[in-house]
């Protein structure tokens, strides 16, 4: 579920239920955010790459109390292949950069967006 | 309120150019794809090609190459679908509509515009 | 290409009846279908996604089911306003096709 990249000619190949529910629920996220979201709680960033789901949960899962995001981590712990809990960081992590919850979506939202759009949009 | 409002309608000599234009209004312009379809009086709908208005990439039907170019103005919201070396049967009603990733549905679609190819 | 064959091609039933059409893909595209209603001299409106998803706005009347290469756009029963061309598509694969429609008329 990590490799999404590889699009072969002719045509590109739909997500996985798992995934293309992930991707709504970012959707929601973003388009249905009033206040800032998690009272605009702070997370680290990550490098979009390979394993970026676990690297997003990793970073995720550091913010508590925060209902709006909760689905969102519960579906990322679905594509990590290892148990992740708070205070745990990958090599992923750009550890001197933090931005808002709501950007750290609105960015990962953005990248799997564009790897379906890989190979079918020249 | 999400709005796709498209220029009005064209009539064209066969071998001549049309330049659509759709004009979108009540959602982030580059967070969804701008799809062009046409229904040809009497008949089904046909998929034209796609942009992505963020990287302006762009997808087009095999049918539709060489002849097709789709472009966006993200400072004016706007798309453009530009049909080449026009034919008769290219006489149709031209819709822009706009999906999140191609494989969500099409959920709002502009008014349509009739482009009328005759000598 | 991935046709899709929507039968059948015309639909003759009065207000009150149920209406059934069928849509059948020609290879698997999951849940990837779309339906569209369309009435004369108007864009389609959206009415089902992924098959069987319903869209906010959409009378409960109108449903779909299916999965694979055969789905079913089904309304339950059929008041004045749903006499129109109703069409399918795929959404699994480029490029994106249409059914060739069905259109339900009144008896």
């Known amino acids: 579920l990590t490799c999404l990249g590889g699009f072969a000619s002719p045509g590109p190949v739909p997500p996985s239920t798992a995934l293309r529910e992930l991707i709504e629920e970012l959707v929601n996220i973003t388009q249905n955010q009033k206040a800032p979201l998690c009272n605009g709680s702070m997370v680290w960033s990550i490098n979009l790459t390979a394993g970026m789901y676990c690297a997003a949960l990793e970073s995720l899962i550091n913010v508590s109390g925060c209902s709006a995001i909760e689905k969102t981590q519960r579906m990322l712990s679905g594509f990590c292949p290892h148990k992740v809990s708070a205070g745990q960081f990958s090599s992923l992590h750009v550890r001197d950069t933090k931005i808002e919850v709501a950007q750290f979506v609105k960015d990962l939202l953005l990248h799997l967006k564009k790897l379906f759009r890989e190979g079918q949009f020249n | 309120q999400v709005q796709l409002v498209q220029s009005g309608a064209d009539v064209k000599k066969p071998g001549a150019s049309v330049k659509v234009s759709c004009k979108a209004s009540?959602?982030?312009?580059?967070?969804?794809?701008i799809h062009w379809v046409r229904q040809a009086p009497g008949q089904g709908l046909e998929w034209m090609g796609a942009?992505?208005?963020?990287?302006?990439?762009?997808a087009y039907n095999q049918k539709f190459k060489g002849r097709v170019t789709m472009t966006t103005d993200t400072s004016t919201s706007t798309a453009y679908m530009e049909l080449r070396s026009l034919r008769s049967d290219d006489t149709a009603v031209y819709y822009c509509?706009?999906?999140?990733?191609?494989?969500?549905?099409?959920?709002?679609w502009g008014q349509g515009t009739l482009v009328t190819v005759s000598s | 290409e991935i046709v899709l064959t929507q039968s059948p091609a015309t639909l003759s039933l009065s207000p009150g009846e149920r209406a059934t059409l069928s849509c059948r893909a020609s290879?698997?595209?999951?849940?990837?279908l779309h339906w569209y209603q369309q009435k004369p001299g108007q864009a389609p409106r959206l009415l089902i996604y992924y098959a069987s998803q319903s869209i906010s706005g959409i009378p409960a009347r109108f449903s779909g089911s299916g999965s694979g290469t055969d789905f079913t756009l089904t309304i339950s029963s059929l008041e004045p306003e749903d006499f129109a061309v109703y069409y399918c598509q795929n959404g699994h694969s480029f490029p994106l096709t249409f059914g060739g429609g069905t259109k339900v008329e009144i008896k």
């Open positions: 009540g959602y982030t312009f580059i967070d969804y794809e």
């Open positions: 509509t706009r999906i999140l990733l191609y494989y969500y549905p099409m959920d709002y």
């Open positions: 290879q698997n595209i999951s849940d990837y």
């Open positions: 942009i992505d208005p963020e990287t302006g990439g762009t």
